[in-house]
């Protein structure tokens, strides 16, 4: 399964989507930054087997789509850069998916990092609130938008460890 | 490695326009935050504004709003700051500096070398 | 604009001085301040943000403190190379706005 290189790829691809999104400066918002507390810590470990760590990526993935799938989103974002970026995350899932079946064999349900997808699962109830708290803002989806972004950016280095490991 | 290089040192007569450039290597240029920043001789640094590629449009400083302006060329990594109607107090180290990429444009992370800008009739 | 004001605005110290530079912010910042440090003829350097995160490549007998409108860098003691001149910045909202500077000079 070469799915760390084609997932970076992807990767690549939706952090491009995802500056080209950005509607107003950074600039203007730097008052409304907040710490989302990225889970690190679960990218950082060396002792996952390949199909949980892909299990944790696609949980990160598969909660970006969540996010910018609802009607909150759809009325912030221009159109045809988040239906660009929507299919360029399901691809990602379906790729993933593929991958973790392949990795483990057809009969066998992998071993899911439990406490890993609960910290993703939670760090995105954060990024939620916040949306919530601040009335989905035009800064407060900046905020966010710049958080995914930094998001992607931590996760593709642990990609890459990913495919060093191969 | 990231790294800033900026023009040459001018000398401009008052009322006229000066333009300087910091080209940037490593990292993705778009996606990172540039700004500008000035210092007169024996004094202190001064923010003029930042711009980040993606974006297009800068952010100035008060101060220096209508007489700076702020532009980024994705094609050549090139970041410009172009100061109208100088004067002798404009006269200055003019630094470009870095932003972390991917994240708000808040701290200076990379500075350029300076470009000395020296007005004088 | 937020206006930051540094105290003392230089100081003569001697190697192995424990050192303290202090900034003040005409509002709260939170957390939002940066320290930088410059030598003659050279850019400025980032030494410490978010006020008391140490930058990488940074020695540790530099530390930031403060949170708020007060704020604090410490030298645990001075190396040669340490004498220089140093600089707070909010980025709390802009204009980013700096201190006037702190030169710390060989007593």
């Known amino acids: 399964c070469d799915l760390p290189q084609t997932h970076s790829l992807g990767n690549r691809r939706a952090l491009i989507l995802l500056a080209q999104m950005g509607r107003i400066s950074p600039f203007s918002c730097l008052k409304d930054r907040h710490d989302f507390g990225f889970p690190q810590e679960e990218f950082d470990g060396n002792q996952f087997q390949k199909a949980q760590a892909i299990s944790v990526l696609h949980e990160m993935i598969q909660q970006t789509f969540n996010l910018f799938s609802t009607k909150d989103s759809s009325a912030t974002w221009e159109q045809s850069l988040l239906e660009k970026f929507s299919t360029e995350l399901n691809q990602q899932l379906n790729d993933m998916e593929a991958c973790v079946i392949q990795e483990v064999g057809v009969e066998e349900t992998p071993l899911m990092n439990v406490d890993s997808i609960l910290a993703v699962k939670k760090y995105f109830q954060r990024i939620t609130l916040y949306l919530t708290e601040k009335k989905y803002s035009p800064c407060a989806w900046e905020v966010v938008r710049a958080e995914i972004m930094r998001s992607f950016s931590l996760s593709k280095i642990f990609q890459e460890r990913l495919r060093r490991k191969e | 490695q990231v790294q800033l290089v900026q023009s040459g040192a001018e000398v401009k007569k008052p009322g006229s326009s000066v333009k300087v450039s910091c080209k940037a290597s490593?990292?993705?240029?778009?996606?990172?935050?540039i700004s500008w920043v000035r210092q007169a001789p024996g004094q202190g640094l001064e923010w003029m504004g930042g711009i980040i590629p993606i974006f297009g449009t800068a952010n100035y400083a008060q101060k220096f709003q209508g007489r700076v302006t702020i532009t980024a060329d994705e094609s050549t990594s090139t970041a410009y700051m172009e100061l109208s109607s100088l004067r002798s107090e404009d006269t200055a180290v003019y630094y470009c500096?870095?932003?972390?990429?991917?994240?708000?444009?808040?701290?200076?992370?990379?500075w350029g070398q300076g470009t000395l800008v020296t007005v004088s009739s | 604009d937020i206006q930051m004001t540094q105290s003392p605005s230089s100081l003569s110290a001697s190697v192995g001085d424990r050192v303290t530079i202090t900034c003040r912010a005409s509002q709260s910042i939170s957390s939002y301040l940066n320290w930088y440090q410059q030598k003659p003829g050279k850019a400025p350097k980032l030494l410490i943000y978010?006020?008391?995160s140490l930058q990488s490549g940074v020695p540790s007998r530099f530390s930031g403190s403060g949170s708020g409108t007060d704020f604090t860098l410490t030298i645990s003691s001075l190396q040669p190379e340490d004498f220089a001149t140093y600089y707070c910045q909010q980025s709390y909202s802009t204009p980013l706005t700096f201190g006037q500077g702190t030169k710390v000079e060989i007593k």
């Open positions: 500096a870095r932003h972390l990429e991917y994240a708000f444009p808040d701290k200076f992370d990379y």
């Open positions: 490593g990292g993705t240029f778009s996606s990172y935050a």
């Open positions: 978010f006020a008391s």
